[in-house]
């Protein structure tokens, strides 16, 4: 069986440039170690935004300088991407890999279109 990954079609970042979405996967096996990667696709270019490997039941740990944070609950991963600007608008794809135990499985979501609108600067007050 292939692994199905679901994520919302569209998310709007808040005024502080933070966007959150859930990445849910249907696990064909009993994984104990899972890797989650967020990819950004724009103009046919794909870049890795962030990645984290976690043990089931434990917290996701992204690198210290990562713009992502997240929590896991069962087969759901709640992802938050921070520091987004209008130029970061694009399709954010959730990739899930069941790393252990064998066999390895990979699943890729259809992507979440994240829209980021830069806030208007506050007018000077006299």
């Amino acid at each position: 069986k292939a692994m199905h990954v679901a994520q919302p079609a569209v998310v709007l970042a808040n005024s502080r440039g933070t966007a959150s979405f859930v990445c849910e996967y249907a696990s064909p096996g009993k994984a104990t170690e899972v890797r989650v990667t967020v990819l950004r696709q724009a103009d046919s270019q794909v870049t890795e935004v962030c990645a984290a490997t976690y043990m089931m039941g434990n917290e996701l740990t992204f690198l210290d300088d990562s713009i992502c944070t997240g929590t896991s609950s069962g087969n759901q991963v709640n992802l938050t991407i921070q520091g987004l600007r209008a130029m970061d608008t694009g399709l954010y794809i959730c990739k899930v890999e069941l790393m252990y135990p064998p066999p390895y499985y990979m699943g890729i979501g259809n992507g979440t279109q994240i829209y980021v609108i830069d806030p208007e600067p506050c007018p000077d007050s006299d």
């Epitope: 890797r35 990667t37 794909v46 390895y104 990979m106």
Partner: antibody
Framework: QVQLVESGGGVVQPGRSLRISCAAS????????IHWVRQAPGKGLQWVAV????????YYADSVKGRFTISRDNSKNTLYLQMNSLRAEDTAVYYC???????????WGQGTMVTVSS | EIVLTQSPGTLSLSPGDRATLSCRAS???????LAWYQQKPGQAPRLLIY???SRATGIPDRFSGSGSGTDFTLTISRLEPEDFAVYYC?????????SGPGTKVDIK
């Protein structure tokens, strides 16, 4: 540019050992899984092994399990395949290949020939 | 493991012809994770199609992939001289990663 270059192939007697290498450049090596795929003369492609990211997770084809060991040195951007107890049927061109962002094998080396013969 | 079967074994065509190559999987479920590769004599394989239907970077639009479930197709709309080669399908969604035996496209 993004590339993989294999080395270390040669002629070896049955039962002996050989280690082949794959040097990567042009991309963040530690962010990708890397595979060994082989092709016997005149035959199709056969996946051999993969090693993921930090090197902790490795998978092997049944035909090489217990005889071959895949490893990587992320500080040197290099992949290895240690082949022990070699058999005539291991004779093939060995390719290293990158598991791309979407999983398919998007970058391939030129291959290194391993011949097992007495 | 997922077994992939390709047909025909050899396809004899002329430049300008349309080529249709088939790949069948022994079980469904890996439709999103099927790739096609081209290999010419003495060269490494080259990724053409991933995800059953997405063209890899730099691949001409005469190459297209389709299919789902267990049946997949690679179509070359108009064969160019450089397209005569062996084509392999592969599933990469689960280990062990498996390939078909290949289809050779040669000049009639």
């Amino acid at each position: 540019q993004v590339q993989l270059v294999e080395s270390g192939g040669g002629v070896v007697q049955p039962g002996r050992s050989l280690r082949i290498s794959c040097a990567a450049s042009g991309f963040t090596f530690s962010s990708y899984g890397i595979h060994w795929v082989r092709q016997a003369p005149g035959k199709g492609l056969q996946w051999v092994a993969v090693i993921w990211y930090d090197g902790r997770n490795k998978y092997y084809a049944d035909s090489v399990k217990g005889r071959f060991t895949i490893s990587r040195d992320n500080s040197k951007n290099t992949l290895y395949l240690q082949m022990n107890s070699l058999r005539a049927e291991d004779t093939a061109v060995y390719y290293c290949s990158r598991s791309g962002s979407f999983g398919a094998f998007d970058i391939w080396g030129q291959g290194t020939m391993v011949t097992v013969s007495s | 493991e997922i077994v992939l079967t390709q047909s025909p074994g050899t396809l004899s065509l002329s430049p300008g012809d349309r080529a249709t190559l088939s790949c069948r999987a022994s079980q469904s479920g890996s439709s999103s994770y099927l790739a096609w590769y081209q290999q010419k004599p003495g060269q490494a394989p080259r990724l053409l199609i991933y995800g059953a239907s997405s063209r890899a970077t730099g691949i001409p639009d005469r190459f297209s992939g389709s299919g789902s479930g267990t049946d997949f197709t690679l179509t070359i709309s108009r064969l160019e001289p450089e397209d005569f080669a062996v084509y392999y399908c592969q599933q990469y969604g689960t280990s062990p990663f498996t390939s078909g035996p290949g289809t050779k496209v040669d000049i009639k």
